[in-house]
């Protein structure tokens, strides 16, 4: 491991303030969603939001934690196996395969920290790696050599 | 701003080693990148990662911040404006368009803390959104109603 | 004024389908996810799933065996809850509920619709 | 999923008693628990959030205590607008489970 410096405030002043900054906007993805007329569909929309007009469309699932950082986190979740025509927005072309993107996000657990014999000293932050899908794509199937 | 209580551990313990684990690897997509033997050309393999593969291919840009957790952001861009036929995998095809998804992610700044007196007490952490293209989705243009 | 205002009662057949919708009033509807709970009569609040408005997000209860779905028209603030393959046992009053929240004390139910009655017979 | 248990299923007060309803979660949920009031014929209304901090305009003769699988609602000094039921949540997983409800009448 490698580490910041990290901020140990003098005695009276709160650590919690001066530590971490964290304002309650939820983390979801950034464009707005509008209804997709077939919520659950596998069809490419002409309006609404990138994951609903995609030849991959996908739905986000939540993913809460409560002792994580962020707690909110969104997992896309493919609604076709394979893409859909432009041609129709509807129906698939089985020459493309929707695949979802997988990416490592920077989370950050909170932990028991302990003071110098074992007592409890409030809480720690520890910072993981945590999978998370982010999007479906559509793509040439890998061809074997 | 609301807060999680933080860890100030007793003097002479290490605060750093306490407060974050934070190691040393970066956080790219999880996929390791083969070569693409047309690096930034407008056309989907048929082997490789996803962002070479997929129809609306993208490259990564990487950005780093010694400041930010985490140091190391990638960010997409679309090799083309439009999709790549999946037949051929290299015409484009001007019924779908090539379009970033972008995400709000979660980062932390370190900036100096100050002790009761605004003395320097090493750095704490300030939590922000920050702007980051994920990839790039292939996706039936709008129609404006 | 924060306002959530329900659609009307609804009579069913066993087997068909029900949507309820919620009109959001006196806050920023993206900013906050949008409960559902339903009290059949004389029993306890069953929590049925909630959305964030903002992307569609959800996350539903799965004992209700994949019958339920949940959308948002975020141009109208408005949230839908859409229940299918319906039994007499789904009789009840549909609750939709905003979810406040702080960063990590608490999420809770803090303005709540007035309730829509369904009555599956 | 989580269960929540509340006790008693009912009870029965009189103006001006401390009155105390607890609820018990199948297992450890921290903090994570919501108290709702709902009077006859009426909408649920939050009346306490993360174990004891007060919803907005909920009078202070009402306070909530715990941790971990135990907790407890208490009016301190009963009053006649006081009669309801009395739900507990939790929120630590998905999904969310409430208790069965405590009736509050007066005697």
């Known amino acids: 491991y490698s580490h910041w410096p990290s901020c140990c405030p003098s005695k009276g002043q709160d650590t919690s303030e001066e530590l971490l900054r964290w304002s309650t906007v939820p983390v979801p993805p950034l464009e707005p969603a509008r209804p997709n007329r077939h919520p659950e569909s596998c069809r490419a929309s002409e309006d609404g939001p990138l994951n609903s007009r995609a030849i991959s469309p996908w739905r986000y699932e939540l993913d809460r934690d409560l002792n994580r950082l962020p707690q909110d986190l969104y997992h896309a979740r493919c609604l076709c196996p394979h893409c859909v025509s432009l041609q129709t927005g509807s129906h698939m072309d089985p020459r493309g395969n929707s695949e979802l993107l997988y990416h490592n996000q920077t989370v950050f657990y909170r932990r028991p920290c302990h003071g110098e014999k074992g007592t409890h000293k409030g809480y720690c932050l520890e910072r993981r790696l945590y999978r998370v899908s982010l999007a479906c794509v559509c793509v040439r199937p890998r061809v074997m050599g | 701003y609301s807060h999680w209580p933080s860890c100030c551990p007793s003097k002479g313990q290490d605060t750093s080693e306490e407060l974050l684990r934070w190691s040393t690897v970066p956080v790219p997509p999880l996929e390791p990148a083969r070569p693409n033997r047309h690096p930034e050309s407008c056309r989907a393999s048929e082997d490789g990662p996803l962002n070479s593969r997929a129809i609306s291919p993208w490259r990564y840009e990487l950005d780093r911040d010694l400041n930010r957790l985490p140091q190391d952001l990638y960010h997409a861009r679309c090799l083309c404006p439009h999709c790549v036929s999946l037949q051929t995998g290299s015409h484009m095809d001007p019924r779908g368009n090539s379009e970033l998804l972008y995400h709000n992610q979660t980062v932390f700044y370190r900036r100096p803390c100050h002790g009761e007196k605004g003395t320097h007490k090493g750095y704490c952490l300030e939590r922000r959104l920050y702007r980051v293209s994920l990839a790039c989705v292939c996706v039936r243009p709008r129609v404006m109603g | 004024e924060v306002q959530l205002v329900e659609s009307g009662a609804e009579v069913k057949k066993p087997g068909a389908s029900v949507k309820v919708s919620c009109k959001a009033s006196?806050?920023?509807?993206?900013?906050?996810?949008m409960n559902w709970v339903r009290q059949a009569p004389g029993q306890r609040l069953e929590w049925m799933g909630l959305?964030?408005?903002?992307?569609?997000?959800?996350s539903y209860n799965q004992n209700f065996k994949g019958r339920v779905t949940l959308t948002v028209d975020t141009s109208a603030s408005t949230a839908y809850l859409e229940l299918n393959s319906l039994r007499s046992e789904d009789t009840g009053v549909y609750y939709c509920?905003?979810?406040?929240?702080?960063?990590?004390?608490?999420?809770?139910?803090?303005?709540w619709g007035q309730g829509t009655l369904v009555t599956v017979s | 999923d989580i269960q929540m248990t509340q006790s008693p299923s009912s009870l029965s007060a009189s103006v001006g008693d401390r009155v105390t309803i607890t609820c018990s979660a199948s297992?450890?949920?921290?903090?994570?628990l919501n108290w709702y009031q709902q009077k006859p014929g009426k909408v649920p209304k939050l009346l306490i959030y993360?174990?004891?901090s007060l919803h907005s305009g909920v009078p202070s003769r009402f306070s909530g205590s715990g941790s971990g699988t135990d907790f407890t609602l208490t009016i301190s000094s009963l009053q006649p607008e006081d009669v309801a039921t009395y739900y507990c949540?939790?929120?630590?997983?998905?999904?969310?489970?409430f208790g069965q409800g405590t009736k509050l009448e007066i005697k």
């Open positions: 509920a905003r979810e406040d929240f702080d960063s990590w004390t608490f999420f809770a139910m803090d303005y």
């Open positions: 006196g806050y920023s509807f993206s900013g906050y996810t």
């Open positions: 959305i964030n408005p903002y992307n569609g997000g959800t």
């Open positions: 297992q450890g949920i921290s903090n994570y």
């Open positions: 993360y174990t004891s």
């Open positions: 949540q939790q929120y630590l997983a998905f999904p969310y489970t």
